[in-house]
């Protein structure tokens, strides 16, 4: 059994999150992950889900009935989802860092975004002019 | 010329968003983009910038003065990134719109927070016996 | 002040083994990865093991796979590395080295070092 | 496996800059934090740059180390060179497997 099964039993607990009337309303995130077969798409998903669990953690760092149990499942996460690769969690943590009332921060995003925009489709890897010939008519065929 | 290029052109004198000193201190997303050439490991990036600009338009919603401009900056992003597949846009809007400080919500992500890890890595593809003796294979020989 | 000190080095004949340790003091032990660097004479650095901070993740470098074992005792802030089967090709210093960053439970740079300690496998 | 390759040796004179690059053989060499180590003479190795550029406490300003994503190398750059440079330097990072490799290190001298 992987490490994280016996501390998300013990989070259960400690939020009540095994009583019955907690499946009521459907799910958060499954059934969106459900919907999701591609990788790429998968990807964009659980970053969500990932940003919402350590923000979860976060709020409740300091309870010691718990630090081991969400330190462990962090872990985890680190391991499956970052592949235990710190840049890459260290990048994604910055990005989930940003405040977005920050007039600083506003102005560098709205600064970097045509160039943020320019990388967002997996065709952004095409020659440029090739690329906005395609955009202009996928976008006259919609 | 992609449409959204003007718009943001208007959306940077709003935001005095081409002055010099906007530059200082280095980027928020683009030295991050750089740093990762993998499609999956881009939309785990990805996912988190764009929830941060769909943030920063809601904050701006009722200004009339670039309405415009958000509106076709954020229906270039849905052809872009969500690949004009507003299922795809809605599932992650929702992942975006869960409140973390709400105990209901809270719950709920803890109760399924097994099942979601277990989804994490790609290797949540092969049947769940073989995949669980992969990750203690993993964790026993590294 | 973060001190290493390992001890265990000498010489052993070709097939034989060694344990080597490594004392730690001036640090939380159990919050940091740790891990064994070699050096053959008048060669260049070579990860050979890590483990992570609890002990519960544990990684080898091809070379000494199935040969070698690392582990630790956080009650005694000690790193062992136990060698078996030990072949010409491991002759070297064994240096044990911190995790330059807590929290993490794989090492991704190494400081401090401590002084080494030399392995001659040698008939 | 990548590898890491760096020049053997390089030499320069006193209060000159000296560049030593690290080239990753494969996969991209942001895509995992670069560390650079000085050896010298007797020494065990000491950290100079971690995390591609950040310098440890009582490393001095002269050493600064850089990723050039085009060339798919890491640099370390070595300002105001002194003759206490002298050694031999490693660059090192971590495959995203639970490797971690080094480079085959580049003496520097230092002339004079």
């Known amino acids: 059994q992987d490490p994280y099964v016996k501390e998300a039993e013990n989070l259960k607990k400690y939020f009540n999150a095994g009583d019955p009337d907690v499946a009521d309303n459907g799910t958060l995130f499954l059934d969106i992950l459900r919907n999701w077969k591609e990788e790429s798409d998968r990807k964009i998903m659980q970053s969500q889900i990932v940003s919402f669990y350590f923000k979860l953690f976060k709020n409740f760092k300091d309870d010691q009935r718990i630090q081991k149990s969400v330190e462990t499942i962090k872990e985890d996460i680190n391991v499956k989802f970052f592949n235990s690769n710190k840049k890459k969690r260290d990048d994604f943590e910055k990005l989930t860092n940003y405040s977005v009332t920050d007039s600083n921060v506003q102005r560098k995003a709205v600064h970097e975004l045509i160039q943020v925009m320019a990388e967002l489709s997996p065709a952004a890897k095409i020659g440029k002019r090739k690329r906005s010939q395609m955009f202009r008519g996928r976008r006259a065929s919609q | 010329q992609d449409p959204y290029v003007k718009e943001a052109e208007n959306l940077k004198k709003y935001f005095n968003a081409g002055d010099p000193d906007v530059a200082d201190n280095g980027t928020l997303f683009l030295d991050i983009l750089r740093n990762w050439k993998e499609e999956s490991d881009r939309k785990i990036m990805q996912s988190q910038i764009v929830s941060f600009y769909f943030k920063l338009f809601k904050n701006f919603k009722d200004d009339q003065r670039i309405q415009k401009s958000v509106e076709t900056i954020k229906e270039d992003i849905n052809v872009k990134f969500f690949n004009s597949n507003k299922k795809k846009r809605d599932d992650f809007e929702k992942l975006t719109n869960y409140s973390v400080t709400d105990s209901n919500v809270q719950r709920k992500a803890v109760h399924e927070l097994i099942q979601v890890m277990a989804e994490l890595s790609p290797a949540a593809k092969i049947g769940k016996r073989k995949r669980s003796q992969m990750f203690r294979g993993r964790r026993a020989s590294q | 002040e973060v001190q290493l000190l390992e001890s265990g080095g000498g010489l052993v004949q070709p097939g034989g083994s060694l344990r080597l340790s490594c004392a730690a003091s001036g640090f939380t032990f159990s919050s940091y990865a740790m891990s064994w660097v070699r050096q053959a004479p008048g060669k260049g650095l070579e990860w050979v093991s890590a483990?992570?901070?609890?002990?519960?993740?544990?990684y080898y470098a091809d070379s000494v796979k199935g040969r070698f074992t690392i582990s630790r005792d956080n009650s005694k802030n000690t790193l062992y590395l136990q060698m078996n089967s030990l072949r010409a090709e491991d002759t070297a210093v064994y240096y044990c080295?911190?995790?330059?960053?807590?929290?993490?439970?794989?090492?991704?740079?190494?400081?401090?070092w401590g002084q080494g300690t030399l392995v001659t496998v040698s008939s | 496996n990548f590898m890491l390759t760096q020049p053997h040796s390089v030499s320069e004179s006193p209060g000159k800059t000296v560049t030593i690059s690290c080239t990753r053989s494969s996969g991209s060499i942001a895509s995992n934090y670069v560390q650079w180590y000085q050896q010298r003479p007797g020494s065990s190795p000491t950290t100079v740059i971690y995390?591609?550029?950040?310098?440890p406490s009582g490393v001095p300003d002269r050493f600064s180390g850089s990723i050039d994503s085009s060339s798919n190398s890491a640099s370390l750059t070595i300002s105001g060179l002194k003759t206490e440079d002298e050694a031999d330097y490693y660059c090192q990072s971590y495959d995203g497997s639970n490797r971690w490799m080094f480079g085959g290190g580049t003496k520097l001298t230092v002339l004079g």
């Open positions: 080295a911190k995790d330059g960053s807590s929290g993490w439970y794989v090492p991704h740079w190494f400081d401090p």
């Open positions: 483990i992570s901070g609890s002990g519960g993740s544990t």
């Open positions: 995390e591609d550029n950040q310098r």
